[in-house]
Interface confidence: low
């Protein structure tokens, strides 16, 4: 599924991301965006093997498991193909576990590099949230 | 071991359709994504898309949707891909493979010819 | 989409030469590359994966480097079972490319 842009912070909100450990909804979007485009059913493979899947491009490595990759943490305790599920429930709660870890979003190179320091608020101007 | 078995050749006519098979043996066939690709002789390989067969996680390349349809059975271990509304240019051998980026392992390839 | 450009097309070798087949990407694909070897009436053959990094049973006469958007994939000394084409494939975004190919002939 790609959402639309309101949609997903429409659906983000409902799910509790909303200043999630201090980020407003509008970082999440803006991760989104440039994670995966909207796309739940993103994926890309890493050099070392691992994959990221979904919305918010999960990786393989530490918080889910796709069975093919070595070493896998699987922190999220979920197999990867629930992160790419149109229901973005999975991804959500995974999600809340990463940026829990300590050095919250920054865990997302695209939010890193594309969201952070810039006016997120913009991700969610004009949705009826 | 790995090992991609595919279909056997198919003759087909102009405005058909068909359904190639892909059986996969000796991995967790439902988290490795199945790839499929197209060769014609002077046109070189042509990546036509992927599946996920554990989620039915689909993509395409642009230019094969609508000509491509890919499906998985977990049950049996196979993969499918259906060609609808054949013409002379989808003659050529198809391949599946398993995905990792790249393919490290390869089906026989499946020869399909278009032909009135 | 990335357009990966073998070249030479064609390359006529001696059994005992050295050779070098290029793959030029049409935008940089980090170290996202692959070679593979196909011959006649064969399914192709992972040789070379991530650029480098041989692949499981693979002699080691084949060689792979470059970064970016300008691979080689190396085979010192060929041997006569080394005939054949030759594909590059990038894993950097989708729609996956494959090069048109390289076909290795002997002279």
């Known amino acids: 599924k790609v959402f639309g842009r309101c949609e997903l912070a429409a659906a983000m909100k409902r799910h509790g991301l909303d200043n999630y450990r201090g980020y407003s909804l509008g970082n999440w979007v803006c991760a989104a965006k440039f994670e995966s485009n909207f796309n739940t059913q993103a994926t890309n493979r890493n050099t070392d093997g691992s994959t990221d899947y979904g919305i918010l491009q999960i990786n393989s490595r530490w918080w889910c498991n796709d069975g093919r990759t070595p070493g896998s943490r699987n922190l999220c305790n979920i197999p990867c193909s629930a992160l790419l599920s149109s229901d973005i429930t999975a991804s959500v709660n995974c999600a809340k576990k990463i940026v829990s870890d300590g050095n919250g979003m920054n865990a997302w190179v695209a939010w890193r590099n594309r969201c952070k320091g810039t006016d997120v608020q913009a991700w969610i101007r004009g949705c009826r949230l | 071991q790995v090992q991609l078995q595919e279909s056997g050749a198919e003759v087909m006519k102009p405005g058909a359709s068909v359904k190639i098979s892909c059986k996969a043996t000796g991995y967790t066939f439902s988290t490795y994504w199945i790839e499929w690709v197209k060769q014609r002789p002077g046109h070189g390989l042509e990546w036509i898309g992927e599946?996920?067969?554990?989620?039915?996680?689909?993509y395409y390349n642009e230019k094969f949707k609508g000509k491509a349809t890919f499906t998985a059975d977990t049950s049996s271990n196979t993969a499918y891909m259906q060609l609808s509304s054949l013409t002379s240019e989808d003659s050529a051998v198809y391949y599946c493979?398993?995905?990792?980026?790249?393919?490290?392992?390869w089906g026989q390839g499946t020869t399909l010819t278009v032909s009135s | 989409d990335i357009e990966l450009t073998q070249s030479p097309a064609t390359l006529s070798v001696t059994p005992g030469d050295s050779v070098s087949l290029s793959c030029r990407a049409s935008?940089?694909?980090?170290?996202?590359l692959h070679w593979y070897q196909q011959k006649s009436h064969e399914s192709p053959r992972l040789l070379i994966k991530?650029?480098?990094q041989s692949s499981s049973g693979i002699p080691s006469r084949f060689s792979g480097s470059g970064s970016g958007t300008d691979f080689t994939l190396s085979i010192n000394s060929v041997e006569t079972e080394d005939f054949g084409m030759y594909f590059c494939?990038?894993?950097?975004?989708?729609?996956?490319?494959f090069g048109g190919g390289t076909k290795l002939e002997i002279k």
């Open positions: 494939q990038q894993s950097n975004s989708w729609p996956r490319t």
């Open positions: 599946i996920l067969p554990g989620s039915g996680s689909t």
């Open positions: 493979a398993r995905g990792d980026g790249h393919y490290g392992y």
């Open positions: 935008q940089s694909i980090s170290n996202n």
């Open positions: 991530y650029v480098s």
